[in-house]
Interface confidence: low
């Protein structure tokens, strides 16, 4: 199937599971590639981006960070090193998850006579709201 880059939702509900979308399509679908991703996070009210995970060779490596331990689930491409969907779930969202996320996509493209490295960063700002506010907003 075709790859379409879709922006992530930006409003997460406290206590619920939230999917942060990161889709990075290859420019030419027929080109073979290997891709890995690193996600970084800057919590609302802080200055520093901190790496929270790396996904490479079908292995999810979580950094030590109590805000995310046991809460991050890979929801991107599976069964391939040629990742185009690099999305994650955060389960049981708390207010500590409000802030700026960066999905860093590192791709090695294999051409007939050479290899080419590319990188792109997808930026996602997430606000965590309580369920009552979310319900009121939908009225």
């Amino acid at each position: 199937g075709g790859c379409v880059e879709v922006d992530s939702e930006t409003e997460a509900v406290y206590g619920m599971t939230f999917k942060i979308l990161c889709i990075s399509c290859k420019r030419r679908s027929e080109t073979n590639a290997e891709t890995f991703t690193e996600w970084t996070f800057r919590q609302k009210g802080t200055e520093e981006f901190v790496k929270i995970l790396r996904y490479e060779n079908e292995v999810l490596q979580l950094e030590e960070d109590e805000r995310f331990e046991g809460r991050v689930v890979w929801n991107g491409s599976r069964g391939t090193k040629d990742l185009q969907d690099l999305s994650i779930f955060i389960t049981n969202v708390t207010y500590n998850h409000s802030g700026d996320y960066e999905c860093h996509v590192y791709r090695l493209l294999f051409f007939e006579n050479y290899e080419h490295n590319t990188s792109v960063v997808k930026k996602i700002h997430i606000e965590v709201v309580d369920k009552a506010n979310r319900d009121m907003a939908s009225i």
């Epitope: 520093e48 901190v50 030590e64 331990e69 046991g70």
Partner: nanobody
Framework: EVQLVESGGGLVQAGSSLSLSCAAS????????MGWFRQAPGKEREFVAR????????YYTDSVKGRFTISRDRAKDTVYLQMNSLKPEDTAIYLC???????????????????WGQGTLVTVSS
């Protein structure tokens, strides 16, 4: 205030195993990420291993990966360092340390740890 007490050190032969324990009085260890460091005679104190509050995430220095295992028992409020295939270069005073921060940056740095034990001596003879 947290007082940390290490135990389990001793003199062993190269290739053997030893298990170190770190217990606390004052405040529960479960509220801290815990690290083990070591200091050999005449050398800088160096990071060995770290375990997060929940016990889900661990870090090791390259020289002990595959030989040492850090773990924690929340019920006993104790942190352990299981050391296998010991080498003479593992000889040092081993100290446990408690870190209240949840930010993972610089987990191996001494100055980010809030409380330290006095240490237990591990001597590995060849």
């Amino acid at each position: 205030e947290v007082q940390l007490v290490e135990s389990g050190g001793g003199l062993v032969q190269a290739g053997s195993s030893l298990s170190l324990s770190c217990a606390a009085s004052g405040r529960a260890l479960s509220t801290y990420a815990m690290g083990w460091f070591r200091q050999a005679p005449g050398k800088e104190r160096e990071f060995v291993a770290r375990i997060s509050r929940s016990g889900i995430t661990t870090y090791y220095t390259d020289s002990v990966k595959g030989r040492f295992t850090i773990s924690r028992d929340r019920a006993k409020d104790t942190v352990y360092l299981q050391m296998n295939s010991l080498k003479p270069e593992d000889t040092a005073i081993y100290l446990c340390a408690a870190d209240a921060s949840t930010n993972p940056a610089g987990y191996y740095l001494r100055n980010r740890y809030d409380y330290w034990g006095q240490g237990t001596l591990v001597t590995v003879s060849s």
